[in-house]
Interface confidence: low
């Protein structure tokens, strides 16, 4: 548990910026296994290695996350540090773990936020926690007392997402990542449904 | 190795507040969380809360709401709990310690590395 | 809140004995589950995670079980380093909650 994210954020720390940089112009254009998103462009050249291995882990879960990090490095000719994730790979039986549904497939059926509207606006409980991990980075002070001054958790939530239409992807990810911490069994729910 | 060394003993009146460290080595501070647990004399473990370093995101036990206050200085690799409005209630040893988390999996949140523990004392 | 109930809350044994503790939580935890252990004016030591982990340098005689709501740890053959107060702590609902801990001492 946890051993393939930090091996995957050690080879990628690993690299200089340089090969970092082409690390992902190659991750935009390497086959995926059906039913998974490719990790959009802009987003992606943006971010640094600890960046890139949560999004490889979101996206792609962690034994898949680790083959597709080995397959990149492979690739660029980097056999060493491939070979090292293959290592780890083995050790922690990630192979097992392969799941065969991505957690998250962005290019087929839009981000989970938008997919789980209605599902997160009956079941949220938790929308202080929810709006304090959001606070500044995503919500703005007015939008964020704007959401605090509704009175149920519905109406909380119904306010929140009048806000989902202006966010890209980073936001949806923030709002994602916060409903991870706070609510995990609602949204292994929803990814399961 | 991975260790979390805290603060030393705290003396304290009611009414008063505390700050207590909890220093990080021999890992990557910024992608791991960091958790506060209390322990009273002779009493079980209770999880105040967690902070995540790197984002400054916090969750707190509702039962700690208003009494403790979670940062971390990415820089020092060093993580703070202020304590505030002490009570006899609050004298216990508190501890940090680490959780591996990722963005997908909850399972992540044990504690793998505990801190050394901070005892803090509130007399009058 | 999650409770967790833990037992026994003491508990005797023998050297060579085989231990079993056990935690039920008040709702299924998805196996969210870790053992700690904790000696005198010692910080807690992590023994098992995801509720079957060995955590990193823990003697193979301990392991973990269970589902749903139901978790164990086993001590297979006790050692006199064994003595100690064990806890559960189920870490996949905010917030997360300990058991009331076991101390397990030498007959």
């Known amino acids: 548990m946890g051993r393939a994210r930090d091996a995957i954020l050690d080879a990628l720390e690993n690299l200089s910026g340089d090969e970092l940089k082409k690390f992902k112009m190659k991750l935009l254009t390497v086959q995926l296994r059906e039913g998974y998103g490719r990790i959009p462009r802009g987003a992606l050249l943006q971010m640094d290695a600890i960046d890139l291995t949560d999004k490889l882990v979101s996206y792609y879960l962690e034994s898949y996350g680790l083959e597709l990090t080995m397959t990149v490095l492979r690739d660029m000719g980097l056999q060493e540090l491939a070979e090292q994730l293959q290592t780890t790979k083995e050790e922690s039986g990630a192979v097992a773990a392969a799941a065969s549904v991505p957690a998250q497939s962005t290019a087929r059926t839009g981000h989970f936020v938008d997919q789980h509207r209605q599902a997160l606006i009956a079941r949220v409980t938790e929308v202080d926690g929810v709006l304090d991990a959001l606070h500044g980075s995503v919500l703005t002070e007015g939008q964020y007392q704007a959401v605090r001054a509704e009175t149920t958790s519905q109406d909380k939530m119904r306010k929140l997402f009048s806000f989902v239409p202006s966010w890209n992807l980073t936001c949806k990810d923030s709002l994602l990542q916060a409903l991870k911490e706070i609510h995990p069994y609602l949204v292994m729910d929803l990814e399961q449904s | 190795q991975v260790q979390l060394q805290q603060s030393g003993a705290e003396l304290a009146r009611p009414g008063a507040s505390v700050k207590l460290s909890c220093k990080a080595s021999g890992y990557n501070f910024t992608t791991y969380g960091i958790n506060w647990v209390k322990q009273r004399t002779g009493q079980g473990l209770e999880w105040i809360g967690k902070?995540?370093?790197?984002?400054?995101?916090?969750h707190n036990n509702e039962n700690f709401k208003g009494k403790a206050t979670l940062t971390a200085d990415t820089s020092s690799s060093t993580a703070y709990m202020d304590l505030r409005s002490l009570t006899s209630e609050d004298s216990a040893v508190y501890f940090c310690?680490?959780?591996?988390?990722?963005?997908?999996?909850?399972?992540?949140?044990?504690?793998?590395?505990w801190g050394t523990g901070t005892t803090v004392t509130v007399s009058s | 809140d999650i409770k967790m109930t833990q037992s026994p809350s003491s508990m005797y044994a023998s050297l060579g004995e085989r231990v079993t503790i056990t935690c039920k939580a008040s709702?299924?935890?998805?196996?969210?589950l870790s053992w700690y252990q904790q000696k005198p004016w010692k910080s807690p030591k992590t023994l098992i995670y995801?509720?079957?982990s060995l955590a990193d340098g823990v003697p193979s005689r301990f392991s973990g079980s269970g589902s749903g709501q139901d978790y164990s740890l086993t001590i297979s053959s006790l050692e006199s380093d064994d003595t100690a107060t064990y806890y559960c702590l189920q870490h996949g609902e905010s917030p997360f909650t300990f058991g009331s801990g076991t101390k397990l001492e030498i007959k």
């Open positions: 310690a680490r959780s591996p988390y990722a963005f997908y999996s909850s399972s992540y949140w044990y504690f793998d590395v």
């Open positions: 709702q299924d935890i998805k196996s969210y």
């Open positions: 902070i995540y370093p790197r984002s400054g995101n916090t």
């Open positions: 995801y509720a079957t």
